[in-house]
């Protein structure tokens, strides 16, 4: 057996499909590894070969394309299951070869079971909707290529276990589900069941996604620094621990990177010699607005440290802000016997 470019097991594409439903799986070679498509390869005389390794087995075996009713078939660069069975779970390999060229990649396929409410181990895609936006739509995903455009499937939408009908602000519109003025109560798992005929048989495709209602960009503001502020003064004696929290509120912004950092005398804490530690915590609101707290800590503060400038900085896609903490050295309380007595003119 001559050398073959083996791309190994492509675990990035962990494919999950439901038991007893059709599945069409494209060979990942043409999508992610090779610079040419299947048509070009086929025209050049290359052949696509499929085989698999059953779950908990080491033995590679050819795929049986002679099952009753063509349950498993190959069409161009697609491996078809009509429908899947639980024991189809395993690692599948597609190999492209001729006498002088060979390239192959394996990928895991997991056939999963669902209950009557569509609960399953399936990893669900998340679709974010903006709160109070006028009309937003989700589309039944990954159903392209299962039936020709001449076939008109029936589509039923569910929220959790319940068929969506007469929901006040959620309206099924074929492959789309429209949300009018979305609220947090619209959070949840939504399932479309697509039913279509093929060669005298009826097939069902089940697709579930998670809807998460998030803060609207029209309400988004630049970061807001709640602490430090002008009302709190960090007054310490040398040798005491200095703790300054920087607490920043970030509006939810799709794909925004929220950052908080401290500077001490204009430098990052890593770039100065004093023994400072920074601890960060993050919390989220129900609409995914974010509050970040970074606590700057100096275990034993010196009088020099108490003269430094401590500035909290924050940045998001909406802008950048900064706020200095008010730090000062505590004036020791006078000792009555000596200092007050002297003040009263005692000798």
């Amino acid at each position: 057996s001559e050398r073959c470019d083996d791309w190994g097991l492509d675990t990035m594409r962990q494919i999950q499909v439901f038991e007893d439903e059709p599945a069409r799986i494209k060979c990942p070679l043409f999508e992610h590894f090779l610079k040419f498509n299947y048509s070009t390869a086929h025209s050049a005389g290359l052949t696509l070969i499929w085989y698999w390794t059953r779950q908990d087995r080491d033995l590679e075996e050819p795929i049986n394309f002679r099952l009753p009713e063509n349950r498993i078939s190959k069409e161009k660069d697609v491996l078809w299951f009509r429908p899947t069975l639980l024991n189809d779970t395993g690692n599948y390999t597609c190999m492209l070869r001729n006498t002088t060229y060979c390239s192959k990649v394996a990928f895991p396929l997991e056939v999963v079971q669902k209950d009557s409410c569509f609960n399953s181990p399936m990893k669900l895609p998340v679709h974010k909707l903006y709160i109070e936006y006028g009309i937003q739509r989700i589309t039944c995903p990954n159903v392209d290529g299962y039936f020709p455009s001449s076939v008109k499937p029936t589509i039923t939408w569910y929220m959790g276990c319940y068929k969506i009908q007469n929901f006040n602000n959620v309206i099924p519109e074929g492959m789309n589900l429209s949300f009018l003025i979305a609220l947090i109560s619209n959070n949840g798992n939504y399932t479309c069941v697509v039913t279509y005929p093929e060669n005298g048989r009826t097939f069902h495709l089940t697709r579930t996604l998670t809807v998460k209602v998030v803060g609207s960009p029209k309400n988004a503001v630049p970061p807001v620094i709640h602490s430090p502020n002008d009302h709190v003064v960090y007054e310490k004696e040398p040798g005491e621990e200095l703790l300054i929290p920087c607490t920043v509120y970030f509006s939810f912004l799709m794909d925004s990177r929220n950052e908080v950092w401290w500077t001490i005398d204009g430098k990052k804490p890593d770039d100065i010699t004093i023994d400072v530690t920074i601890n960060e915590s993050i919390s989220h609101s129900r609409t995914e607005d974010e509050t970040r707290t970074q606590i700057l800590s100096i275990k034993k503060v010196t009088s020099e440290d108490l003269k430094r400038s401590y500035v909290c900085h924050a940045r998001s896609a909406k802008g950048e802000v900064a706020k200095a903490a008010k730090v000062k050295q505590k004036v020791p309380a006078p000792r009555y016997t000596v200092e007050l007595a002297c003040g009263f003119g005692a000798t």
Epitope: E132, Y133, G134, I135, N168, N169, L180, L183, S185, N219
Partner: antibody, heavy 118, light 107 residues
């Protein structure tokens, strides 16, 4: 100061039509969802309709669906309620109210009375 | 739709006394509940939102509590201007729905 001022109410015969307006001032109208809420004489409050800040999303109570249409003109800071096929049971004071998900109906107009009677 | 039920329908209280109004939702509305005050011939006024947060300008004698299905509005010491009708309203699910109201009258 936030102000909402309704107009357009009056006496109308059953089966007739009326268009209510609500002029808004003192806030960025185009940033807020708006609603109509009504109150029949001596009765409680009933939500009638809502419209999103951009005017695209509209929702209606079952009791008015297909007969009432909510709309807005953000350039004029005005909310509208077109009421068709009016019935005696639509007789009420109609309030416009500003809403935010976080704060519900935070500002209300003074109301306009709609009387449906022959 | 979510049905909101208020009790009692009428509450007779003397000035200076505490008034406790109840509101129950037919299903959970989380903390998405508001309280409004309405005086004769006037529009409703928002008192409480988020079940317990006082709206701008509302005196501290008004407080709200509860979450899920059971909510309470408490007026710690009734003033003469507090005698009015009070409505609870859920804004968790469309359609947003109101309770039938509780009238607080002078005893």
């Amino acid at each position: 100061e936030v102000q909402l001022l309704e107009s357009g109410g009056g006496l109308v015969q059953p089966g007739g039509s009326l268009r209510l307006s609500c002029a808004a001032s003192g806030f960025t109208f185009s940033h807020y969802g708006m609603s109509w809420v009504r109150q029949a004489p001596g009765k409680g409050l009933e939500w009638v309709s809502a419209i999103s800040y951009d005017g695209e999303g509209t929702l209606y109570a079952d009791s008015v669906k297909g007969r009432f249409t909510i709309s807005r003109d953000n350039s004029k800071n005005t909310l509208y309620l077109q009421m068709n096929s009016l019935r005696a049971e639509d007789t009420a004071v109609y309030y416009c109210a500003r809403f935010r998900y976080y704060t519900a109906f935070d500002y209300w107009g003074q109301g306009t009375l709609v009387t449906v009677s022959s | 739709e979510i049905v909101m039920t208020q009790s009692p329908a009428t509450l007779s209280v003397s000035p200076g006394e505490r008034a406790t109004l109840s509101c129950r939702a037919s299903q959970s509305v989380s903390s998405n509940l508001a309280w409004y005050q309405q005086k004769p011939g006037q529009a409703p006024r928002l008192l409480i939102y988020g079940a317990s947060t006082r709206a701008t300008g509302i005196p501290a004698r008004f407080s709200g509590s509860g979450s899920g299905t059971e909510f309470t509005l408490t007026i710690s010491s009734l003033q003469s201007e507090d005698f009015a009708v009070y409505y609870c309203q859920q804004y968790n699910n469309w359609p947003w729905t109101f309770g039938q109201g509780t009238k607080v009258e002078i005893k």
